[in-house]
Amino acid sequence: MMCLECASAAAGGAEEEEADAERRRRRRGAQRGAGGSGCCGARGAGGAGVSAAGDEVQTLSGSVRRAPTGPPGTPGTPGCAATAKGPGAQQPKPASLGRGRGAAAAILSLGNVLNYLDRYTVAGVLLDIQQHFGVKDRGAGLLQSVFICSFMVAAPIFGYLGDRFNRKVILSCGIFFWSAVTFSSSFIPQQYFWLLVLSRGLVGIGEASYSTIAPTIIGDLFTKNTRTLMLSVFYFAIPLGSGLGYITGSSVKQAAGDWHWALRVSPVLGMITGTLILILVPATKRGHADQLGDQLKARTSWLRDMKALIRNRSYVFSSLATSAVSFATGALGMWIPLYLHRAQVVQKTAETCNSPPCGAKDSLIFGAITCFTGFLGVVTGAGATRWCRLKTQRADPLVCAVGMLGSAIFICLIFVAAKSSIVGAYICIFVGETLLFSNWAITADILMYVVIPTRRATAVALQSFTSHLLGDAGSPYLIGFISDLIRQSTKDSPLWEFLSLGYALMLCPFVVVLGGMFFLATALFFVSDRARAEQQVNQLAMPPASVKV
C-alpha cells in the first residue's frame, strides 16, 4: 500500500521553503516593528503553521483557533490579519494560478502517480513472479523490502543534491533511470531472480530522487493556499498511483497474456513524463533565507536539532506510531492480493495458479479499494479531527489512536472473513484501510504543531526515515519469512499456503494496536509539547537588537 511519505511529506513537502517563507514573514513583521508576529502563511501540504497568538492556523483538517500563549497576564499578540495590514506591510500578491505553473504542477503530480504505479505494479503481479522465478513468500517479500531500503537510503542523499544542483535535471534523470531499469527487468530470465531483486533496489534509488525533490519545486512555484492545494494534489497521487499499480499489473497481464508486459507500461509513461518535466517545468529559484533566518540557522546545529527532536515526546511517539502504520500498509499492500487469491483457492472459487497470468482479479479489486480508501481516509480523518477539536485539545492524536485501534479490529476480521467469504474480506479491507489511512493528514498536523519551523525539515526527514526503517523496509520480507517458516514447521499444501500467510499477516493488527498505543502516548504529551513549541516560536520571532531596521 502507500508508504508514509504521504503522511510525513504531505506535512512537510518543501519544508525548507516553508521555513524560509516563514522567516521572511517574520522579518517583515520585525521591520514593521509590529510587536510580535504570527506565522501568517499556509504551510506546505496542510501542515499547521505554528503561531504565537490567538490566531487561526490553517491545516488540512481546517482552521483551528488557538488560545493566546505567553506569560500569564500578557495579552495575546496581534494576529496575522492585523499584522499584514500594518503600515509598510508588503502585501503578498494574490496567488494566481498561472497556466505554466499549473501545467508544471500537473506534470510533477503525474510523475508522482507514475512513481507509485511502478512501485505497486510488482505487487499486482506477485503471484506470477513467484511462479516464473520459482520463489517462496520470503523471496517475493524481498522485492519490496530491497526497494524500500534503497529508497530510504537514497532519499536523504537526493535531498542534499536537490538543495545544491539543478532540480529538474535530477528529477528527469531519476525518472529516466528507473524507467530504463524497470523496462530491462521485464526481460530477466527465470534463473536470475537476484537480478530482479537488484533491479528493484535500483528503481528505489531512482524513485527516491523524485519523492524528495518534486515537492520542493511545487513549494517554490506557489504560495499560501494555492501551494497547500497543489501539494495536496501531489500527495493524493500516492493512493491513486498505488491503486493504479495493482490495476495496471493485473489488467495489462490479462490483456497481453504475459505478466512481463505489466513491467513495460510505467517505463514508457515514465520516459514521456521525464521529457515533459524537462520541457514544461520552469527552473525555479529556491527561497532565500533572510537575515533573521540566517541567525536562526547559525544558532541551531543539526546535532542540537536532533537532540531537541529526540526529547520531544509527542514527536517521538507519533513517529513510532507512523512506523506502525508504515509496517502494516507495507505488508498488507504487498501480500493481501496474494492472500485473497489463496483464500479463493481454498474456497474453490479459483484454482491454484501454475501458469501465469495469475490472480488478476484480486489485484484489480484491491487496487480500486486502495485508490478510494486513500482519498476517503484523508477526508474522514480531517473531518473527524476538525469536529473533535471543538471538544478537546488532544483531538489530533486521539482521532489517530481511535482510527488505528478501529483499523486493527477490521484487519483482524479480514482473516476471519477470508475463510468463508471473499466479499466479506473485501469489506473488512475497505473499512480497515480507510481507518488506517485516516491518520495521514493528522500525523502531518501533529508534527507541525509540536516542532518549531526551523526544525521541521529535519523532523520530516527523520520521521520519514524512521517510518521506513521500522516500518515498510522490513515488513514485506518479514511476513514472507514468517509464512515460509510456518509452512516448514507444518506442511506445504494449498490450505497451508493460505493459512501460513494469514497467520503471518496477523502480525499487522498487533503492530497497528501498538501504533494506536503510541498515539495515545502522544495524546498525553501533545498539549504541553505544542505549548512549548509555540513559546519557542515566540522567542525566535522576537527581533534581536543587532538587526538593523
Epitope: Q130, E351, N354, S355, D492, P494, L495
Partner: antibody, heavy 118, light 110 residues
Framework: QVQLQQSGVELAKPGSSVKISCKAS????????ITWIKQTPGQGLEYIGY????????YYNEKFKGKATLTADKSSSTAFMQLSSLTPDDSAVYFC???????????WGQGVMVTVSS | DIVLTQSPALAPSLGQRATISCRAS??????????MHWYQQKPGQQPKLLIY???KLASGIPARFSGSGSGTDFTLTIDPVQSDDIATYYC?????????FGAGTKLELR
Amino acid sequence: QVQLQQSGVELAKPGSSVKISCKASGNTFTSNYITWIKQTPGQGLEYIGYINTGSGKTYYNEKFKGKATLTADKSSSTAFMQLSSLTPDDSAVYFCASLTGVDYFDDWGQGVMVTVSS
Amino acid sequence: DIVLTQSPALAPSLGQRATISCRASQSVRMSGYNLMHWYQQKPGQQPKLLIYDASKLASGIPARFSGSGSGTDFTLTIDPVQSDDIATYYCQQSKDDPYTFGAGTKLELR
C-alpha cells in the same frame, strides 16, 4: 477443471524400475500440487506423496520413501513417478490427482495398472 | 497416522436414504475447517470428489449427496438412493500427514 492424462499399462520384472507420467491439460489455472495414490484390493487407497510443480518441492509418505521418486517437467506440464526395486507387492493401480482447496483430491487421472511379475 | 474407520457395506432400497459413517482416530478439525472429504469410486474408474470440508458439495455433484459431522464423527448421506449410486465410498482426512483414506463402504442395492 484440469484433465490429468496418465500413461498406459506397465509390466515389469522384480528388481526393475518403472516411470509413470501424468500430463495436465485444460485450464491454465492448474494445481501446483500433483499427488500420487496407490490402490490395491487388499490395502485400499494409500497416499504416496506429492510434488509442488511450482517450487519442485516433494513430500513422501514414510512408507513410500525410497520406493517412489516424484519429479515434474514444468514446460510440458507433466509430473512423473518412478518406482524402483519393484516387488510383487508394488502391483497396483497408481493414480495421479491434483491437490487443491482444503487439501482434497479434486481431479484424478484414469490410473495406471502396474503389474510386477517374473 | 490418523486411522479412518468406515462401515464395510450398506444395502439400502432404491429411493431410500443411505447413511455412510466415518470415524477418525483423532479430531480432524483445524483452523475452523473440518478436514474430512468424501469420494465415490465406481468399478474400473478413478475416484470422484463428492464432498469436501465435511459438508460442502463439490461442483457437478447432485444435491441428493450431503455431508455432516465435526471433530471425529462424519456422515455421508444419499437421499434418495438411485441405481447410479452403486459404488464404493471413501472418506479421506487432510489434517495430518500422511493423508489417509478409510477402507471404503460398498453401496449395493437391496
